[in-house]
Structure formats: C-alpha cells, structure tokens
C-alpha cells in the first residue's frame, strides 16, 4: 500500500498522527476492533504532550485508550514498551479492583474526568480514541 500523507475526513492531525474521537460508547474490545477496522489502533500515549492533546479533545469523560493487562502485564496495543514508557495513572492506580461484583478485576485503561488514567472493567461502554500514524503504509491500493 501507499504511505498515508494526510488524515482521513473527520480525523484530527497532530504530530504526524491522526486521531478520531468517538461520541458514543463501546466495550474496550469493541472499541479496539473498531479502530483496527479503520486501519488504526486505540490511542497509545507516549508523552505528556500527547496526553494533553488527547485530554483537550475528549474533555472530562471516561475514554478508553490502547492499554490493557487482560493477559498479565500491562501492554500497549501497538507494542510500545509499557515499563519504560509514559504513564499518567491516578494515585494508587491501577488497582485491579474486584469490588464491582462483575467478576474478575479491572483490565483496561481509560482516561478519567481529569485526564489521569484508571483501570476499569473492560465491558464498560466508554468513549474511545483511535490513532494511526501518518508515516505508516495504508491498506488502500495506490492511485494510478
């Protein structure tokens, strides 16, 4: 495929990435799948600057990001290293809280109303943010 040079319609460009902000809610897995079908991924936050950009666009609303620990350690959906990377958890989070009574703990990360991160039950229908890099090859065939 060809290299994407500009963002799709209704996506916002920022620092060589394109972002799409949902206005409805989905469970984390459904949000993850939505982004993948758009040749993108749930947002991966790699810096304080990117955190502030996303926070500005989503406002004080719980919003999924591309970070989960459903299979043990915390992992970013694009393979970015979690241990050495940017983090912005709320104090004493993540806590894998079981008190919700829905079974198991909390395995998916979201932006909270103040932008800091929390882990929550992945089935909760939160808004989400998709991200794709401008420099990556798109799946669309090149125009002749």
């Amino acid at each position: 495929g060809s290299e994407r040079t500009c963002c799709p319609v209704n996506w916002v460009e920022h620092e060589r990435s394109c972002y799409w902000f949902s206005r409805s809610g989905k469970a984390w897995a459904d949000a993850d799948n939505y982004c993948r079908l758009e040749d993108a991924h749930l947002v991966v936050v790699t810096s304080w600057e990117e955190q502030k950009f996303v926070q500005h666009h989503i406002g004080p609303v719980n919003t999924w990001m591309g970070l989960h620990d459903q299979n043990g350690p915390w992992k970013w959906v694009d393979g970015t290293d979690y241990e050495t990377g940017f983090k912005n958890w709320r104090p004493e989070q993540p806590d894998d809280w079981y008190g919700h009574g829905l079974g198991g703990g909390e395995d998916c990360a979201h932006f909270t109303d103040d932008g800091r991160w929390n882990d929550d039950v992945c089935q909760r229908p939160y808004r989400w943010v998709c991200e794709t890099e401008l420099d990556k090859a798109s799946q669309e065939p090149p125009l002749l």
């Epitope: 459903q70 299979n71 350690p73 915390w74 241990e83 989070q93 993540p94 806590d95 703990g105 395995d107």
Partner: antibody, heavy 120, light 107 residues
Framework: QVQLQESGPGLVKPSETLSLTCTVS????????WSWIRQPAGKGLEWIGR???????NYNPSLKSRVTMSVDTSKNQFSLKLSSVTAADTAVYYC??????????????WGQGTLVTVSS | DIQMTQSPSSLSASVGDRVTITCRAS??????LNWYQQKPGKAPKLLIY???SLQSGVPSRFSGSGSGTDFTLTISSLQPEDFAPYYC?????????FGPGTKVDIK
Amino acid sequence: QVQLQESGPGLVKPSETLSLTCTVSGGSISSHFWSWIRQPAGKGLEWIGRIYIRGSTNYNPSLKSRVTMSVDTSKNQFSLKLSSVTAADTAVYYCAREGKTGGVSYFDYWGQGTLVTVSS
Amino acid sequence: DIQMTQSPSSLSASVGDRVTITCRASQSISSYLNWYQQKPGKAPKLLIYAASSLQSGVPSRFSGSGSGTDFTLTISSLQPEDFAPYYCQQSYNISFTFGPGTKVDIK
C-alpha cells in the same frame, strides 16, 4: 524461568509478628500481582493477600486486621507481616505470582514454601 | 466470600482409569475457575485455568469443563505420577478461595 524463594524465621512466638520475604528471580516484579498463600499441615490452601508494585493491596477479610504486605522493587522482593500470631497460624507459607489470561487470574509460579511454627 | 466445595474428598483408582473430580461454587463464577495438583512436600502446580484452558507443559490427559457453579476436572487415563491431591480455586471474587481438595490415591 521465573523463580520465587521464601525466607524468614521458621519459629515465631505467640503474640509476636511473623515476617517473611519472597525474592523473585528470572523476571521483573513490576509486571504482576504477587500473593501469599498458606497451608496448615494436612489441610487446604488459604489465600492471605496480594500486592502490586504501585502499592495496591488486597487482603483476605478473615486476616485483614493482622496482615501487612510491602514490596521492594529495587531488590525484586515482596514481604508479608502477620501480627499477633497464635498456634493456628502455624503453616507452610507460599509466595506466588498471579498470572492472567483473558482476564482470568491464576497462580502460575510458586515458591517452594517455608514452614512457620508458632510456639513458645 | 464465595465458598468452594469438592467431591469426592478422596477417591481410589488404578493406573489407566478415567477419573472425574467435581468442584462447586456457592454462586455463579462464570469461568473464573482454576485447578491445581499438589505433590507431597511440594507447592501446588497449575493444571487448568479459566475452567478449561490447559496450562503450558501440562499433559493433555488433563481437561477441565464447566461454567457458572459446576466444574469438572477429568484425567482421561490415570498415570502413576497423577496420584496426588487436587484443588479448585476461584478468581471471580477477591479472596481467591480454594476448594478443600480431592485426594486421588492408588486402589
């Protein structure tokens, strides 16, 4: 290969505090929850509690008032303190790693266990 | 707390036998159920997680089934090294309660 090793006194006097440490090798302590589980001789397994590196803890309600857990990431160790012990706390104490697949937690790596006897 | 019960508490069987152990939860725990084997003087070993998933390195003669409140561990053809106690454990609720165990011994 992840390995866990419990250490601490094998004999504790009644009313005193039991202190154990688990050293993790072959993997980072940062990536998982870590638990303590005990087993009195000839009996079943009892989960004591768990800890995560950011300080989050969960304790068995039946032991909560007496249990404290802590973690030292620089040494790749986590610890258990159980206060006001009685003979009923005599058991083999295991440390274990909490694994997870598809959101379901389980204990996939265990220490070999250390026997703690409470006696004067 | 969620209570876990196991039946039978012990059973006698011969090498080659098909053995079934049952675990019951006091409330629905979906598939948040794990099985362990414990040899004398050793730590428990994870056999099955999430009710039916075989842990890496565990022989395929071990299998698990069930969901909700009723679960089963099956050993399709008992081997000499399988004589040991077996424990179920729930991770639906914090407290991670274990069943009382089922001891499998030689007939």
